[in-house]
């Protein structure tokens, strides 16, 4: 029961974590204009992995994508790669872990197979979480490095854009979402790995008994095969779960001249 709970909780925690990683990757607020003390400008700049946005006090918000690939800093590309790898590994991990859940029975899948799948998904979640944490941390480090360089944008030269204003950028909401989500995915992965140990059926330790037949000396070891081989039907301690798969069912804005948003 504890194993099932650990596995289920690990799956749920990882699911939330991966959803968070996806959300963080898509968010525009990776870096936001530093508003410490007073706003220097009447526009608010913020940037994501894929586009930069400007919000005026009029309420008008405009976002522009980074349409160049080669012109982007290597660090930004690395962060993108880490986040995408994290999402892909997490998604595969989720897929694998769904079939590994003890409460879902698929054909005649043995516990050992489920244990292996649980371990695989756990490792995937751990790597996914680490990728997200690493990606967010690399970006945060970029921000810290560039924070005091108030006369230069961290994407200077990107797509021919030159920063001409003294704008400093600080941590955006996406960084905190990414760190938390990465941590949750990591914790979920660890829980899956712990659950794997409880899922793996232990080898039945019967003492070897020798049967002496006339003219032959053959030693038989009952229960000598592990359940993972698929031989034998050691159903004595095997629990059959009759449970089907359970499914549980979230730019640019314009103010009107006559309607200030």
């Amino acid at each position: 029961m504890a194993v099932t709970a650990c596995q289920g909780l690990g799956f749920v925690v990882s699911l939330i974590g991966i959803a968070g990683i996806i959300a963080a990757t898509c968010m525009d607020q990776w870096s936001t204009q530093d508003l410490y003390n007073n706003p220097v400008t009447a526009v608010f700049n913020y940037q994501g992995l894929w586009r930069s946005c400007v919000r005026e006090s009029s309420g008008f918000t405009e976002c522009r994508g980074y349409f160049t690939l080669l012109g982007l800093p290597a660090m930004l590309q690395a962060v993108r790669a880490l986040m995408i790898v994290g999402i892909v590994l997490g998604a595969i991990g989720l897929l694998v872990s769904i079939f590994a859940l003890k409460c879902i029975r698929i054909g005649s899948m043995e516990d050992s197979a489920k244990a292996n799948m649980t371990l695989t998904s756990g490792i995937m979640f751990i790597v996914s979480g680490l990728c997200a944490i690493a990606g967010v941390s690399v970006f945060a480090n970029m921000l810290v490095t560039n924070f005091w360089m108030s006369t230069a944008n961290m994407y200077t030269g990107m797509g021919g854009m030159v920063q001409t204003v003294q704008t400093r950028y600080t941590f955006g909401a996406a960084l905190f979402v990414g760190w938390v989500a990465g941590g949750l995915t990591l914790i979920g992965g660890v829980m899956m790995c712990i659950a794997c140990r409880g899922l793996a059926p232990e080898e039945t330790n019967y003492k070897a008994v020798s049967y002496h037949a006339s003219g032959h000396s053959v030693a038989y070891k009952p229960g000598g095969f592990k359940a993972s081989t698929g031989f034998g039907s050691n159903t004595k301690n095997k629990k059959i779960y009759d449970g089907g798969a359970r499914t549980e069912d979230e730019v640019q804005s314009y103010p009107s001249k006559h309607d200030y948003v």
Epitope: A42, V43, N45, S52, V54, S58, V165, P255, V261
Partner: antibody, heavy 117, light 113 residues
């Protein structure tokens, strides 16, 4: 039709305070309203802004110690109070509604404040 | 504070003439994030509040005649009236809409000869 209607002209003595109102009609009263003044024969001078939604305000450092901007959401009215009046505060005071590019698309008709002993 | 310098202070032109008004800011008004210049032009007639003509340095406000056009980037901006009409007699103000405090130029007075 969008309108910003300001209160009438005021005559004040030096050291006194004046409170000018600006009532908005014809649009949703949710974004920054700015105050600009113009001394006779002079240019325009930005005093500050107030967000009617949350009453947050930003003031020109020159007026920070003397100006207070408030709002009354129930009547869609913003107020600008200037204290410790001096003769050089004699000017026409305008309220203005913000638009694209942080420009001022809609202006009140102006309120003449005369500071004289 | 950002200093906005307008030139000339005043000018008198003939009807139908092309006129160029200049505005220079002490710092660049270009925002790198959206590549827009936060400079606005207003027209003010005697006894009236200013009227919005151009925002983002070159975007004409709806209802403004197309003889008015704005150009420039960074620190240097111009307002051009391709063919001056009698109703264009006014004071023209440029405004920094980017840095706090938002500042205005001293104005250029346009008159008809």
């Amino acid at each position: 039709q969008v309108q910003l209607v300001q209160s009438g002209a005021e005559v004040k003595k030096p050291g006194a305070s004046v409170k000018v109102s600006c009532k908005a009609s014809g649009y949703t009263f949710t974004n920054w309203v700015h105050w600009v003044r113009q001394a006779p024969g002079q240019g325009l001078e930005w005093m500050g802004e107030i967000n009617p939604t949350n009453a947050r305000s930003n003031y020109n450092e020159k007026f920070k110690k003397r100006v207070t901007m408030t709002r009354d959401r129930s009547t869609s009215t913003v107020y600008m109070e200037l204290s410790s009046l001096r003769s050089e505060d004699t000017a026409v005071y305008f309220c203005a509604g913000i638009y694209y590019g942080n420009s001022f698309a809609h202006w009140g008709q102006g309120t003449l404040v005369t500071v004289s002993s | 504070d950002i200093v906005m310098t307008q030139s000339p202070d005043s000018l008198a032109v003939s009807l139908g003439e092309r006129v160029t008004l200049n505005c220079k800011s002490s710092q660049s008004l270009l925002n790198a994030g959206n590549q827009k210049n936060y400079l606005t032009w207003y027209q003010q007639k005697p006894g009236q509040p200013p009227k919005l003509l151009i925002y983002w340095s070159s975007t004409r406000e709806s209802g403004v005649p197309d003889r008015f056009s704005g150009s420039g980037s960074g620190t240097d901006f111009t307002l051009t009236i391709s063919s001056v009409q009698a109703e264009d007699v006014a004071v023209y103000h440029c405004q920094n809409n980017y840095y706090y405090p938002l500042t205005f130029g001293g104005g250029t007075k346009l008159e008809i000869k």
